[in-house]
Amino acid sequence: QERRFQLEGPESLTVQEGLCVLVPCRLPTTLPASYYGYGYWFLEGADVPVATNDPDEEVQEETRGRFHLLWDPRRKNCSLSIRDARRRDNAAYFFRLKSKWMKYGYTSSKLSVRVMALTHRPNISIPGTLESGHPSNLTCSVPWVCEQGTPPIFSWMSAAPTSLGPRTTQSSVLTITPRPQDHSTNLTCQVTFPGAGVTMERTIQLNVSYA
């Protein structure tokens, strides 16, 4: 007989495009030895899994590299990690534990993942005042980006003389040496999420003081 178990937590989760979400899953505490097998996450109605730890099983092209089964039977963990969320990931998913040698396995309840438009925008921080002729470091940050996602691409646009400084997964530094004529001009930080094909930007007006 196919055995059923309930996924703990909410029946649906929301994630913004390009970001990450963890679909929580805990294996049943009483798991007969013969039922132990590989773990598979399925999109409702599909035969090919979106994620698995079965070395002989293919996963859906659309989710390869973005959906991962977090497998740790010692901690009863069978959670699904989704990164670089895309609009078409919007669906119901369920987990199945099964050995290919056995007729039956364990199937979880369904959980819906809702993928919304990205509403977060980059932050631009300026340390103090911008002085004409003096270099200053501006930081464009996206603190809401998850570390395990595909690193975003940062682009800066400004008429002022600039040079790129260090960057991390979540931030990019721009060194700017403003001139008097750069006062009230626009500076834009554009962030693209290549995993989901989404671009967000923030524009500020430069306030340059004269030395």
Epitope: Q1, S34, G37, N53, P55, D56, R74, W101, M102, K103
Partner: antibody
Amino acid sequence: EVQLLESGGGVVQPGRSLRLSCAASGFTFSSYGMHWVRQAPGKGLEWVAVISYDGSNKHYADSVKGRFTISRDNSKNTLYLQMNSLRAEDTAVYYCARGGQTIDIWGQGTMVTVSS
Amino acid sequence: DIVMTQSPSSLSASVGDRVTITCRASQSISSYLNWYQQKPGKAPKLLIYAASSLQSGVPSRFSGSGSGTDFTLTISSLQPEDFATYYCQQSYSTPYTFGQGTKLEIK
């Protein structure tokens, strides 16, 4: 009570054939994967073959591939191992065992001796 | 094929001792590791599956740990009935290979 009872073992000459049977009782045989595991005298366990619940999927150890065939008859609750072209190194106790990726029930074994 | 290597091959211990047997896989097998106990003239018996899950009816003095390539079976306090041969087996991919065994003897 879950039980597996092997039969068909005996003494056979090299190159000859032998068919082992395993009668299952106490569980829904047609829902379980089944294995054959062998143990040469004084040696360790050697996994031989596995068959899926419906017989559609089979895998073998390299040492027996092409010579041994695992099969099942779910209507008779019986597992089989057809052993052809037997060699001296096939001499062992053959265990029938239940399970998927984990063997949880074992039979008591049947002895196969390949000798001229 | 995945090669399973157990150590030690044999081990002498006394009742009440804490004993650890290790098993190493030639490649990562995640948590797909089972431990069996076999007494002379008897069929093997499942002790631990999924590297650390205790089979129903097996005393809690037996425990398993590990993931990837390195695994251990621990008997916290040896009892007279624990003197036997222990085998690890990987069930990650066929052929489902066994370790060569560890014979646990009375000191």
